[in-house]
């Protein structure tokens, strides 16, 4: 969490941003909030990016003002116009690109004053893993698959029964480049699986950590998966 204050001229207002991550090819949100104003026409929002000459986005007098918008963001940005009046200056970024990563500034002017805060935005690819029993294999085998990751993640297997065990000798992980030549499909196979146990396939890079669990008993198979972004710090 980054909290910034305005300085010179008028009074300062508090602006708060939260570091976040974008999943390339999907839409992302750059979060920013500020002390609200009662008049929308008095609010100016500017988003800037370090190393980019034009503005990322500008909103003033109740509407977008994109005459100075940088080419790399053209047609890809929007604020939540109906929420600006309550202090939400968050930016929606469409079709996140790897090159969108970097340091952004949310700069606000209201009738109360000015303020700004920076935000670190990471980009990559992350997806939920799915763990299945591989019935084609000669021994009891689990197969963990996740369709899109970047940068290349690490994959670690764990088991509820054999806590602390190292499964690297009985597992094999491969990374297959997807058609857009950036993200990769992750496939990890775990051999010599025992029944009545819960296994976890953990995939992690510097942006996200995802876990796929599978519980195999003689009568049923239960699956669960979850994904956590690693860098959500507020400023």
């Amino acid at each position: 969490l980054i909290i910034g204050f305005g300085i010179s001229g008028r009074h300062s207002i508090t602006v708060t941003t939260v570091a976040s991550a974008g999943n390339i090819g999907e839409d992302g949100i750059l979060s920013c909030t500020f002390e609200p104003d009662i008049k929308l026409s008095d609010i100016v929002i500017q988003w800037l990016k370090e190393g980019v000459l034009g503005l990322v986005h500008e909103f003033k007098e109740g509407k977008d003002e994109l005459s100075e918008q940088d080419e790399m963001f053209r047609g890809r940005t929007a604020v939540f116009a109906d929420q600006v009046i309550v202090g939400n200056a968050s930016l929606r970024l469409k079709n996140v690109q790897l090159t969108d990563a970097g340091t952004y500034k949310c700069y606000i002017i209201t009738s109360k004053g000015k303020g700004n805060a920076n935000l670190e935005y990471k980009t990559g690819a992350f997806s939920m893993p799915e763990v299945n029993v591989d019935y084609n294999a000669s021994s009891e085998t689990l197969r963990c698959e996740a369709p899109r990751w970047f940068p290349q993640p690490t994959v670690v297997w764990a088991s509820q029964v054999d806590q602390g065990a190292n499964f690297s000798e009985v597992s094999n992980t491969s990374f297959e480049l997807n058609s857009e030549n950036v993200t990769m499909k992750v496939v990890s196979v775990l051999y010599n699986v025992t029944i009545n146990n819960t296994y976890s396939c953990m995939i992690e890079n510097d942006i996200a950590k995802a876990t796929g669990d599978i519980k195999v008993t003689e009568s049923e198979i239960k699956r669960r998966s979850h994904l956590q972004l690693l860098n959500s710090k507020a400023s």
């Epitope: 370090e50 500034k105 700069y107």
Partner: nanobody
């Protein structure tokens, strides 16, 4: 106050070279990315190149890639644009600009120099 003064423009033949310079003052030069852009009369400004404060990162528009080189000298508060193999379509007013991103940024801040004219003609 940010001040940027470009120089080095002139008339050059197709295939020729020019080196543009930009003298910066009024801010902590080495902390900022610097940019070059150009404008043909009647058209919008076109960004062409940028360089990070430590010179470790540079990038170029496709239209100038392989022909133009950006550099800087933080001791002298100078940024340069070496232009080789110039073409008629490179004719424009060339502007040096400071990155907006910084603690001193304010609404309406002028980050541009006044420009220097480059004419490529035989």
């Amino acid at each position: 106050e940010v001040q940027l003064v470009e120089s080095g423009g002139g008339l050059v033949q197709p295939g020729g070279s020019l080196r543009l310079s930009c003298a910066a003052s009024g801010f902590a030069f080495s902390n900022y990315w610097m940019h070059w852009a150009r404008q043909v009369p009647g058209k919008g400004r076109e960004w062409i190149s940028r360089i990070s404060g430590d010179s470790e990162s540079t990038s170029y528009a496709d239209s100038v890639k392989g022909r133009f080189t950006i550099s800087r000298d933080n001791a002298k508060n100078m940024v340069y644009l070496q232009m080789n193999n110039l073409r008629a379509e490179d004719t424009a007013v060339y502007y040096c600009a400071r990155d907006r991103f910084g603690d001193d940024y304010y609404y309406g801040m002028n980050v541009w120099g006044q420009g220097t004219t480059v004419t490529v003609s035989s």
